[in-house]
């Protein structure tokens, strides 16, 4: 809709940004699917949750994720101590007390059980993309987005703004 933002080129990380409020500005329960309409599902296996990207059978119920929205200051790329406007960040929780986390060392997306306040790895800048899609950029690693790799969620480095329309980092949010 609003067009696609370019990749955050700053060496200053988004984790220098500050979440304006401790409590979310709003919450939204939605199913998450890929650009190609595959569903993101969550399964409890051996006391931990696994995340899958798969085609659902007809009439199979989609898993829901609670998106909590936070307003955040966007750090300036100038002196480093300025503020360059506002942005929206989200946390994603498919079940009580579990949140999606960015594991930047392993380039993976994992479900971790944790208490509030949540760690920075649980926060993602929400981008309003073309074609009614969104993307999720790691707060802790600018230019790195949640994406799809080998039927799993992974962290994908987007090295230029032209590549932000790559289908594997585009997601759809739906109430159904």
């Amino acid at each position: 809709a609003f067009g696609i933002s370019g990749v955050q080129k700053y060496t200053r990380a988004l984790h220098d940004s500050s979440i304006t409020g401790i409590s979310p500005i709003t919450e939204y329960l939605a199913s998450l699917s890929t650009y190609n309409d595959q569903s993101i599902t969550f399964a409890l296996e051996d006391e931990s949750y696994e995340i899958y990207v798969e085609d659902l059978k007809k009439d199979e119920k989609k898993d829901k994720v609670l998106l909590s929205y936070y307003e955040s200051q966007h750090p300036s790329n100038e002196s480093g101590d300025g503020v360059d406007g506002k942005m929206l960040m989200v946390t994603l929780s498919p079940t009580k007390d579990f949140w999606l986390h960015a594991n930047n060392k392993e380039h993976s997306v994992e479900l971790h059980k944790c208490e509030k306040p949540l760690p920075d790895q649980a926060f993602f800048v929400l981008h309003n993309m073309h074609s009614n899609c969104v993307s999720f950029e790691c707060k802790t690693d600018p230019g790195v987005f949640i994406g799809v790799k080998d039927n799993h969620l992974a962290l994908i480095k987007v090295d230029s703004s032209e590549n932000l329309c790559t289908e594997n980092i585009l997601f759809k949010l739906s109430e159904t």
């Epitope: 809709a1 609003f2 067009g3 696609i4 933002s5 370019g6 990749v7 955050q8 080129k9 700053y10 500005i25 709003t26 919450e27 939204y28 329960l29 939605a30 998106l67 929205y69 966007h74 300036s76 790329n77 100038e78 360059d84 406007g85 506002k86 942005m87 929206l88 800048v125 929400l126 981008h127 309003n128 993309m129 073309h130 969104v134 230029s160 703004s161 032209e162 590549n163 932000l164 329309c165 949010l173």
Partner: antibody
């Protein structure tokens, strides 16, 4: 400091052409979606066109489709609006605007440049 | 396209008074659980300035006397106590879908 400075406005005859420019500074230009919004004298605001940071996508209001072209040169930190087949109703102050990081709203505005279409 | 209707067209008030401005959308501006309705202030000879985004969140450097509320199709901008510099024209705008549209504006003038 984030700044947007428009130029290229002026008086043009109906049917004529004009190219507006917007020089951006104080931020990583390619990281942001950019737009043009216009305001006829004494009137309200009208969104004209938007271009994504990576130049991949453009959108236009119906009244300018086929006549106006939005473009950008990320190496020069400059946004453009090529206006052809100009009409009297295109007379307005044209503002260059930058979206916020993530593209949810118009956050930064230039001072505007006046385009007058008249014979 | 989504049509935004602002009321009243003009609001005549004195400094220190409370201003309540309304914006009604022809259809819901909700998307992804957000109300994508923004408010701008414009003074003569100046560009618009972002006041409120996503219905209720203040832009950078905006004083706390400005607040936004509403959801779906009905939205309100409130200025709790008017300062002399607040007398201006206020526009609402939706960023849910193209074409992005603005209301016709409400002028807040000194009584």
């Amino acid at each position: 400091e984030v700044q947007l400075v428009e130029s290229g406005g002026g008086l043009v005859q109906p049917g004529g052409s004009l190219r507006l420019s917007c020089a951006a500074s104080g931020f990583t230009f390619s990281s942001f979606s950019m737009s043009w919004v216009r305001q006829a004298p004494g009137k309200g605001l009208e969104w004209v066109a938007t271009i994504s940071g990576g130049k991949t996508f453009t959108d236009y209001v119906d009244s300018v489709k086929g006549r106006f072209t939005i473009s950008r040169d990320n190496s020069k930190n400059t946004l453009y609006l090529q206006m052809n087949s100009l009409r009297a109703e295109d007379t307005a102050v044209y503002y260059c605007t930058r979206a916020n990081y993530g593209n949810w709203f118009f956050e930064v505005w230039g001072q505007g440049t006046l385009v007058t279409v008249s014979s | 396209e989504i049509v935004l209707t602002q009321s009243p067209a003009t609001l005549s008030l004195s400094p220190g008074e409370r201003a309540t401005l309304s914006c009604r959308a022809s259809e819901s501006v909700a998307k992804y659980g957000l109300s994508l309705l923004n408010w701008f202030q414009q003074k003569p000879g100046q560009p618009p300035r972002l006041l409120i985004f996503a219905a209720s969140n203040r832009g950078s450097g905006i004083p706390a006397r400005f607040s936004g509320s509403g959801s779906g199709t009905d939205f309100t901008l409130t200025i709790s106590s008017l300062e002399p510099e607040d007398f201006a024209v206020y526009f609402c705008q939706q960023s849910k879908e193209v074409p992005f549209t603005f209301g016709q504006g409400t002028k807040v003038e000194i009584k």
